[in-house]
């Protein structure tokens, strides 16, 4: 889980070693609780590569880092589909693929990733400040989207084309490493909770270090399935503008950030309120949770308004592996 947890400053019961130890053992459960509750939050990664041989040709790769089965993927450009964006391709794991110009070839790479070769020329070249968006619908996570703008000026000859290896490693790390750490952390958390069960807890105070730092809030694990929107980052490799990647931030990212609300209505907020949390600077694409599935014909407990750009879908569709283009 790449979302940072912001833990409130704790007022130690007394100075000295015992106070320091108390501080540490009480901060740790908060961190672990955050990790446990947000464990397994899926995200979408997007990779854009300009072909060195054909300067007007681009390869867009998108993947879903989550445990659910993917029921549909759409790729659009010019912004999110439905908000000025134009659909480039729609991929269904069983019923095949449709693609539209300037898309040349859309295909499944794995059960959770797709690639799209795009042809552009002159003014329609994707490098001209184009935003690409990938949407994944999966069961049971719901609908997720990642978007970002291609840098306007670039020299594709300056950097080698990226390889999928880092993404595959990230996937394995997510499955193996994070799962192991979280399992250990959750067990340790239970141990700590049992130890502190009969001890009076010190009073929590909000952090004074930053007036904008969101306060930590604990929320029940039963609510975790409807947890607050997380804005983790997704790795982007682009040879459109080598060596520099924009920071995705509500005030410095793509223009469509302006349409995003600064709160998630009727959804419990996690320890880091997403609207004011800077996103790590490794990529300019962000993954935004768009909703959760419910059982067929049912609404989930929260029925509050979804995001402006990303409406809140609800409904099951579990699919098997990709069967390729019909």
């Amino acid at each position: 889980m790449r979302t940072e947890a912001q833990v409130p400053a704790l007022q130690p019961p007394e100075p000295g070693l015992e106070g320091a130890m108390g501080h540490r053992t009480l901060v740790l459960p908060w961190v672990l609780l955050t990790l446990c509750v947000t464990a397994g939050t899926p995200e979408v990664w997007v990779q854009v590569r300009m072909e060195a041989t054909e300067l007007s040709s681009f390869t867009i790769r998108c993947g879903f880092l989550g445990s659910g089965s993917i029921s549909l993927v759409t790729v659009s450009w010019g912004g999110p589909n439905g908000a000025g964006g134009t659909t480039l391709a729609v991929l269904h794991p069983e019923r095949g693929i449709r693609q539209w110009a300037p898309a040349r070839q859309a295909r499944w790479e794995t059960q959770s990733s797709i690639s799209l070769i795009l042809e552009g020329s002159g003014a329609s070249s994707p490098c001209a400040n184009t935003t690409f968006c990938c949407k994944f619908a999966s069961f049971p996570e719901g609908s997720w989207e990642a978007c970002g703008s291609l840098p306007p000026s670039s020299d594709p000859g300056l950097s080698a084309p990226p390889t999928p290896a880092p993404i595959l490693r990230a996937d394995l790390a997510g499955i193996l490493g994070v799962s192991g750490v979280l399992l250990f952390g959750c067990v340790y958390l239970l141990h700590l909770l049992r130890r502190h069960k009969h001890r009076p807890a010190p009073r929590l105070q909000p952090s004074r270090t930053s007036p904008q730092a969101p306060r930590a809030r604990a929320w029940a694990p039963s609510q975790a399935s409807q947890a607050a929107l997380h804005v983790p980052y997704a790795t982007i490799n682009t040879s459109c503008r080598p060596a520099t990647l924009d920071t995705a931030h509500p005030h410095g990212g793509p223009s469509w950030w302006a349409s995003l609300p600064t709160h998630a209505a009727h959804r419990p907020q996690g320890p880091a309120a997403w609207a004011s949390t800077p996103i790590p600077a490794r990529g300019s694409f962000v993954s935004v949770e768009n909703g959760l599935y419910a059982q067929a014909g049912e609404r989930p407990p929260h029925t509050g308004p979804g995001l402006t750009l990303f409406p809140d879908p609800r409904g099951p569709r579990a699919m098997e592996g990709p069967l390729g283009v019909r």
């Epitope: 029921s71 134009t86 693929i97 099951p316």
Partner: antibody, heavy 120, light 110 residues
Framework: QMQLVQSGAEVKKPGSSVKVSCKAS????????ISWVRQAPGQGLEWMGG????????NYAQKFQGRVTITADESTSTAYMELSSLRSEDTAVYYC?????????????WGQGTTVTVSS | QAVVTQEPSLTVSPGGTVTLTCGTS?????????PYWFQQKPGQAPKTLIY???NKHSWTPARFSGSLLGGKAALTLSGAQPEDEADYYC??????????FGGGTKLTVL
């Protein structure tokens, strides 16, 4: 097999709006695109737009852009088409259609149609 | 917006063969237009016969087939029956997942 049942006939005044519903039954709803097509009396078919309910975003024919709104409610497996600023030439039978076995955004199964009459 | 053209009307004898075509103002029709063919009888909703150029539905009679022919989408009816008398519409897909119907062909089985 999937069935699409549409709402009943409507009579509207020019300048008003109409909202036609299309309820799906007999299959899953979320990741199957639903399209709206209309047919004026004695005329051919005209595609208005479509939506993939799971994503909630719709795309529209240029002709209807800004005047039509297509939405979907997954909890009731129902799609809606709202047409505003009605004119007499909007008098038509409005159909919903959705994919079933074809690739995404297909039109395999059709609703029975809803007659909308615009008259002053 | 692209214009999709069809023959306004065609006549076929019972048991005969007829081919309906569908062209586009943007050039040649390709499999990337995902051609559809629909049958519509008076007072009824359209019925999908062919999707994605040549794929048939379970309810599509075997005598109907779809293909690409000389830069156009084609619907061929071999062994026409009286019940095949209807209007036939083709549908093509264009960039941005937009769709355009042809004007329709009135098929008479005489």
């Amino acid at each position: 097999q999937m069935q699409l049942v549409q709402s009943g006939a409507e009579v509207k005044k020019p300048g008003s709006s109409v909202k036609v519903s299309c309820k799906a039954s007999g299959g899953t709803f979320s990741s199957y695109a639903i399209s709206w097509v209309r047919q004026a009396p004695g005329q051919g078919l005209e595609w208005m737009g479509g939506i993939i309910p799971i994503f909630g975003t719709a795309n529209y024919a240029q002709k209807f852009q800004g005047r039509v709104t297509i939405t979907a409610d997954e909890s009731t497996s129902t799609a809606y088409m709202e047409l505003s600023s009605l004119r007499s030439e909007d008098t038509a039978v409005y159909y919903c259609a959705r994919e079933e076995v074809s690739s995404p955004y297909g039109m395999d199964v059709w609703g029975q149609g809803t007659t909308v009459t615009v008259s002053s | 917006q692209a214009v999709v053209t069809q023959e306004p009307s065609l006549t076929v004898s019972p048991g005969g063969t007829v081919t309906l075509t569908c062209g586009t103002s943007t050039g040649a029709v390709t499999s990337g237009h995902y051609p559809y063919w629909f049958q519509q009888k008076p007072g009824q909703a359209p019925k999908t016969l062919i999707y994605d150029t040549g794929n048939k539905h379970s309810w599509t009679p075997a005598r109907f087939s779809g293909s690409l022919l000389g830069g156009k989408a084609a619907l061929t009816l071999s062994g026409a029956q009286p019940e095949d008398e209807a209007d036939y519409y083709c549908l093509l897909s264009y960039s941005g997942a937009s769709w355009v119907f042809g004007g329709g062909t009135k098929l008479t089985v005489l």
